[in-house]
């Protein structure tokens, strides 16, 4: 996910004013004027604020990377949603980017979960019913694996 | 609790510069998102410029971009604001501040209206 215009003190000019601060604080979708007078819509695609707030600027919208899709545009009021590609998955530890699903389990090991835009596949030890978490170990013969993955033990 | 202290302001003409400076003291200077507003004679607080603790992010008020720069020297505990082409309008006490709740988004720090350690203030009057 990327920050759309990295250059704040290049934001264009603000839209037209809405109303007036209710306790210093303007709804979603607005942020504070620059003497807190007013409230000003944010710009919709561009920018957008979740809560009553007193920001001078509203929040830019992310943009979804290659690799993922988009679920759901941003407005106003809520950022862009992205989810990872059908294939990858964004694991909570680097969320920067989606990395491919593994393709099958080491051997010896059976799939008890599917691959999805937040999981690898999740695969258990055939007799102990062990999860393995994370891929396929280097010195353990697989049935199949997407390439570049580092090994991690079992748990 | 930081402390701020304001200096630099004076009498300036019309089209000429100065330099603000703001000295913080009693917490760690490169942890704190700063800016500066005013107030002028009569009127209430106005944004006037914003940067983030790493110097990454920074904003500027429609009235005073292309004209005034701010800056800051984590190894000196200094915020700076360099005013240039100065206006008969841009006579106000400026304020530094510090934004004790920042608001980050993405990596990026967006600034407050609601800033809430302040400085004691210093005059610039253009005339």
């Known amino acids: 996910i990327t920050q759309q215009d990295l250059a704040p003190q290049q934001r264009a000019a603000p839209q037209q004013k809405r109303s007036s601060p209710s306790e210093g604080l303007c709804p979603p979708g607005h942020h504070i004027s620059e003497d807190g007078r007013d409230c000003i819509s944010c710009k919709y695609g561009q920018d957008y604020s979740t809560h009553w707030n007193d920001l001078l600027f509203c929040l830019r919208c992310t943009r979804c990377d290659s690799g993922e899709v988009e679920l759901s545009p941003c407005t106003t009021t809520r950022n862009t949603v992205c989810q990872c590609e059908e294939g990858t998955f964004r694991e909570e530890d680097s969320p920067e980017m989606c990395r491919k699903c593994r393709t099958g389990c080491p051997r010896g090991m059976v799939k008890v979960g599917d691959c999805t835009p937040w999981s690898d596949i999740e695969c258990v030890h055939k007799e102990s019913g062990t999860k393995h978490s994370g891929e396929v170990p280097a010195v353990e013969e697989t049935v199949t694996s997407s390439p570049g993955t580092p090994a991690s033990p079992c748990s | 609790e930081v402390q701020l202290l304001e200096s630099g302001g004076g009498l300036v003409q019309p089209g000429g510069s100065l330099r603000l400076s703001c000295a913080a003291s009693?917490?760690?200077?490169?942890?704190?998102?700063m800016g500066w507003f005013r107030q002028a004679p009569g009127k209430g607080r106005e944004f006037v410029s914003a940067?983030?603790?790493?110097?990454?992010?920074?904003y500027y008020a429609d009235s005073v971009k292309g004209r005034f720069t701010i800056s800051r020297d984590n190894s000196k505990n200094t915020l700076y604001l360099q005013m240039n082409s100065l206006r008969a309008e841009d006579t106000a006490v400026y304020y530094c501040?510090?934004?004790?709740?920042?608001?980050?988004?993405?990596?990026?720090?967006?600034?407050?209206?609601?800033?809430?350690?302040w400085g004691q203030g210093t005059l610039v009057t253009v005339s």
């Open positions: 009693g917490s760690t200077f490169s942890s704190l998102d």
């Open positions: 940067i983030s603790r790493s110097g990454d992010n920074i």
């Open positions: 501040a510090v934004d004790s709740q920042p608001t980050y988004s993405g990596g990026v720090y967006y600034p407050r209206y609601g800033m809430d350690v």
